[in-house]
Amino acid sequence: DLKVEMMAGGTQITPLNDNVTIFCNIFYSQPLNITSMGITWFWKSLTFDKEVKVFEFFGDHQEAFRPGAIVSPWRLKSGDASLRLPGIQLEEAGEYRCEVVVTPLKAQGTVQLEVVASPASRLLLDQVGMKENEDKYMCESSGFYPEAINITWEKQTQKFPHPIEISEDVITGPTIKNMDGTFNVTSCLKLNSSQEDPGTVYQCVVRHASLHTPLRSNFTLTAARHSLSETEKTDNFS
């Protein structure tokens, strides 16, 4: 009996430019003899329904149809037919199929590969054309993929134990596609600093599929107006 097992859940997520290993494990009732077996990896793009050969291994012959693609012969001996793809790109997302032949038996498995790019975030203060005591803070998120992103603004005053989401005077622009396929977006917060308590911390919070925890940039209103800080992971409400 020959069986192939892919990533649990049928989906693998990998960061852009990563050296990804797409898992494929072979289960066979007898010890594997790699000289008398074959492995072929196929890829089907998200946009075209056509399957393309990525890599093949037969006995003493192996060929990479995608530069750098490799299945380790040493690992194959112990049933690991995982495909390694260095420097994965956005356009390489899609369905990957691992086909194993141990004559006369054949088994296969498929997995969806999602390629994500994490946003970079920065905070800018724009006072051009603003009235006295009125400031516009811009939170720029760039280089992310996929397009879906959630940007919110939060504030925390000195006295209260938790932050609160700000919904008024927030404008988030449209996402803009970059040449490399990633996206950028800017969210703006308009503040009347004369109406806010010194010591209040404002924070731009970016949530995206590529992030385990939100990305944060914050600034604190001080008696002498404000101090901007570029933070991703610090004691953000200090």
């Epitope: 939060e154 000195q158 209260f160 134990p161 938790h162 409400f237 200090s238």
Partner: antibody
Framework: QVQLVQSGAEVKKPGASVKVSCKAS????????MNWMRQAPGQGLEWMGG????????DYNEKFKGRVTMTVDTSTSTVYMELSSLRSEDTAVYYC??????????WGQGTLVTVSS | DIQMTQSPSSLSASVGDRVTITCKAS??????VAWYQQKPGKAPKSLIY???NRYDGVPSRFSGSGSGTDFTLTISSLQPEDFTTYYC?????????FGAGTKLEIK
């Protein structure tokens, strides 16, 4: 990292006073507000009041006004909560708490005050 | 003072169950509601702020919703470590007030 370390358990007689301390470390002490909460055995949580750590502002729950005093010693980064005219229903665990960061607010480990004759 | 009425006061469930705890404020508190988990002998730990935002490190099975006067905490698939007590808190104004708590017990 931020730490709030409270003083040890106390046993008091009715009518006496108790002073619980909370020593803070790991952050700029004076730029924060510290709240005090309490929790009677098997009961819910109750806010008692708070103090700005520069020592220039306090806010007390009306229920405790006249009995509670919160003070700060900035030289040792310590906050104190004193409760007077103790009665049996003041038996509780007392907590100091500080506004949080992205992992939530910070709490001391709690101080059990037992009021018993 | 703003009263926070939490229900149920206790709840029996099994590992893997989906459970919902509700909290009703006596007046409009916007989204200024937090949820805490408290294990016996320990200080409360905050899970949710601003009604629906999870603090970092809090498992995704915990979610909050609501605004105005009605709020819920949902645990989508109970784990053994979730069987403890939960409190809601309003922080729109002083005095800060809490719900009376919901004790989650293993069925």
């Amino acid at each position: 990292q931020v730490q709030l370390v409270q003083s040890g358990a106390e046993v008091k007689k009715p009518g006496a006073s108790v002073k619980v301390s909370c020593k803070a470390s790991g952050y700029t002490f004076t730029s924060y507000w510290m709240n005090w909460m309490r929790q009677a055995p098997g009961q819910g949580l109750e806010w008692m009041g708070g103090i700005y750590l520069s020592g220039d502002s306090t806010d007390y729950n009306e229920k405790f006004k006249g009995r509670v005093t919160m003070t700060v010693d900035t030289s040792t980064s310590t906050v104190y909560m004193e409760l007077s005219s103790l009665r049996s229903e003041d038996t509780a665990v007392y907590y100091c708490t500080r506004r949080g960061d992205y992992f939530g607010d910070f709490w001391g480990q709690g101080t059990l005050v037992t009021v018993s004759s | 003072d703003i009263q926070m009425t939490q229900s149920p006061s206790s709840l029996s469930a099994s590992v893997g169950d989906r459970v919902t705890i509700t909290c009703k404020a006596s007046q409009n508190v916007g989204k200024y509601v937090a949820w805490y988990q408290q294990k016996p002998g320990k200080a409360p730990k905050s899970l949710i702020y601003s009604a629906s935002n999870r603090y970092d490190g809090v498992p995704s099975r915990f979610s909050g919703s609501g605004s105005g006067t009605d709020f819920t905490l949902t645990i989508s698939s109970l784990q053994p470590e979730d069987f403890t007590t939960y409190y809601c808190q309003q922080y729109i104004s002083y005095p800060l007030t809490f719900g009376a708590g919901t004790k989650l017990e293993i069925k």
